[in-house]
């Protein structure tokens, strides 16, 4: 099985024990590590941060001691913006220039492939996204002709039904991608006005349309029905939680909220907590399991957080094995307890290790 793990370059800027550099990563933990994100500038792939090349080096040095590890560079992301991707993909010359710029950049910096993180193609971009993937793959095939190992091509796709329908020709893009990471998280957010788990495995008992689509099981099944081969589908598992501020004394699933949860000490983003911050939060919190959805949530005071723990990730891995998927994807290594100092287990990357162990189990 593949264990595809994302590393985010901005994690370097977190304070103190939250700061994560690629040389802190475990070289034997994942089969693939994806560096997020690269930029596109002047129609050429480029670094996002000025110091990215230093981090590329740190990451790719991990392969010196584990030659089986593959690294990919992810281009795009939320801050890149869909419009910029759209302009490049829809213009033949811009698209060609971008595609041509990718192999030398990846080779120079020691990457084994490219991950496309166009978040998200609009309805009018659907065909252009397919063309971009098809032409990128053709370039990779051509570039590898002189006996080089062919560069890998993957894409991170939304797990939301509405976005899947408008953005992707799943059957066509699947032909050209080496694997597809389906982002089976962020199904529920503060915009709903109520508490809810952002990455449930199954549909909740109370879920009616459109909530019945907002779970991992539906998204995976839908992708498979649309023509994604199970052998290329990698299922996303988050090492972060989504938090809410409760608006009343109600604390269960569906309780009213006044907004996102308070920011974490290190990640400093309202409504989001890294797993290592959740471990801190759990001291003195009340933990519940949403039985049908097979995921936990915790409450403390007026704070509510839905997250994944070692038990829920094992359930998710068993699910993906039952569906004969290619493996699991983790967002993100730097949100797991990468130092092993927060979650009281004396184990670095406890969630990702639990995923790895579950994948390896017979």
């Amino acid at each position: 099985y593949k264990l595809v793990c994302y590393y985010t370059s901005w994690s370097q800027y977190r304070e103190g024990d939250g700061s994560c550099f690629p040389d802190a990563l475990d070289r034997f933990l994942c089969t693939h590590i994806i560096y997020s994100f690269a930029n596109i500038s002047n129609d050429h792939i480029d670094t996002w941060e000025w110091n990215d090349v230093t981090l590329y080096g740190m990451l790719n040095t991990l392969k010196n001691r584990n030659p089986n590890l593959k690294t990919l560079l992810s281009v795009g992301g939320w801050n890149f913006g869909s419009q910029r991707f759209s302009k490049i993909a829809s213009n033949t010359q811009s698209r060609r220039t971008f595609i041509k710029s990718v192999p030398p950049f990846l080779r120079t910096h020691g990457f084994d492939g490219l991950d496309l993180a166009w978040l998200y193609p609009g309805r009018r971009d659907k065909q252009h996204f397919t063309t971009l993937i098809k032409e990128m793959k053709a370039e990779f095939i051509k570039e590898a002709q002189p006996g080089k190992k062919q560069l890998l091509l993957s894409a991170a796709l939304s797990a939301g039904k509405v976005t899947i329908d408008s953005s992707y020709d799943i059957a066509k893009i699947s032909q050209h991608l080496d694997f597809i990471s389906i982002m089976t998280y962020d199904f529920h957010g503060a915009w709903r006005g109520t508490t809810g788990h952002h990455s449930p495995l199954f549909r909740g008992q109370e879920d009616a349309s459109p909530d019945r689509f907002s779970n991992t099981d539906y998204a995976v099944g839908y992708m498979l029905r649309l023509g994604a081969p199970a052998s290329k589908l990698v299922m996303g598992i988050p090492t972060f939680g989504r938090s809410f501020t409760l608006a009343s004394s109600e604390t269960g699933v569906g309780a009213p909220i006044s907004g996102p949860g308070i920011p974490g000490r290190f990640t400093k983003e309202a409504g989001t907590l890294a797993y290592y911050e959740i471990c801190d939060f759990l001291r003195g919190a009340t933990v519940h399991r949403i039985l049908g959805q097979q995921v936990p949530y915790a409450t403390k005071g007026n704070q509510w957080v839905g997250y994944d723990d070692q038990e829920s990730v094992k359930s998710k891995v068993q699910y993906l094995k039952d569906r004969q998927l290619a493996g699991a994807m983790v967002w993100a290594l730097d949100l797991d307890d990468f130092q092993g100092s927060f979650c009281g287990q004396d184990l670095r990357f406890p969630l990702t290790n639990a995923i790895k162990d579950a994948l390896a189990a017979t």
């Epitope: 370097q12 800027y13 700061s19 550099f21 500038s41 002047n42 050429h44 792939i45 480029d46 670094t47 000025w50 110091n51 990215d52 090349v53 230093t54 981090l55 590329y56 080096g57 740190m58 710029s101 030398p104 950049f105 080779r107 120079t108 910096h109």
Partner: antibody, heavy 117, light 107 residues
Framework: EVQLVESGGGLAQPGGSLRLSCAAS????????MHWVRQAPGKGLEWVSS????????NYADSVKGRFTISRDNSKNTLYLQMNSLRAEDTAVYYC??????????WGQGTLVTVSS | DIQMTQSPSSLSASVGDRVTITCRAS??????LNWYQQKPGKAPKLLIY???RLQSGVPSRFSGSGSGTDFTLTISSLQPEDFATYYC?????????FGQGTKVEIK
């Protein structure tokens, strides 16, 4: 072997112009950010300007902003520094440096710019 | 702008000595500090990047440590070829700035 060779230095009048060039070889020039760093006689190092690999992002020290322009031609493996409105305090050895992220891992031998009337 | 202050500005040492140079940033720069060595009439050479990572080809007697505002370059056993001027450089935010340099001379 990485090589960076600066040229274009010399004597210039205050208010005058010079264009420095840096010919690069031994690495994939188009995949790296490039930089200019200067050193006044007997003084320390001062970062001057940087340009990303695509040429799409440029930064300048306040002391040269609006007067100096960094550019690159990836097809020629060459970095440039156009220096206008030169001042006596711009007198220095100008080094071209290859970027290893936000550090400078290879440097040219430098070219001396003297601004004097 | 972030100010970088090196100390001492010069020092005299003998071959085999352990030498320590410090660099202080005027604000938190995480681990984004680089160290360079420069010999008279020559271009600088990168020794340490990102506070503690040894640049390829640099002898292991050189080491760097620190994060936040306080950083150290250590030469565990000074060799004749190590007599030079050493500069720190912050790479956290523009404008990138250098320390004023530390000259290591023969005692």
């Amino acid at each position: 072997e990485v090589q960076l060779v600066e040229s274009g230095g010399g004597l210039a009048q205050p208010g005058g112009s010079l264009r420095l060039s840096c010919a690069a070889s031994g690495f994939t020039f188009s995949s790296y950010a490039m930089h200019w760093v200067r050193q006044a006689p007997g003084k320390g190092l001062e970062w001057v300007s940087s340009i990303k690999s695509s040429g799409g992002s440029k930064n300048y020290a306040d002391s040269v902003k609006g007067r100096f322009t960094i550019s690159r031609d990836n097809s020629k493996n060459t970095l440039y520094l156009q220096m206008n409105s030169l001042r006596a305090e711009d007198t220095a050895v100008y080094y071209c440096a290859k970027g290893y992220g936000a550090s400078f891992d290879f440097w040219g031998q430098g070219t001396l710019v003297t601004v004097s009337s | 702008d972030i100010q970088m202050t090196q100390s001492p500005s010069s020092l005299s040492a003998s071959v085999g000595d352990r030498v320590t140079i410090t660099c202080r940033a005027s604000q938190d720069i995480s681990s984004w500090l680089n160290w360079y060595q420069q010999k008279p009439g020559k271009a600088p050479k990168l020794l340490i990047y990102a506070a503690s990572r040894l640049q390829s080809g640099v002898p292991s007697r050189f080491s760097g440590s620190g994060s936040g505002t306080d950083f150290t370059l250590t030469i565990s056993s000074l060799q004749p070829e190590d007599f030079a001027t050493y500069y720190c450089q912050q790479a956290y935010s523009f404008p990138w700035t250098f320390g004023q340099g530390t000259k290591v001379e023969i005692k």
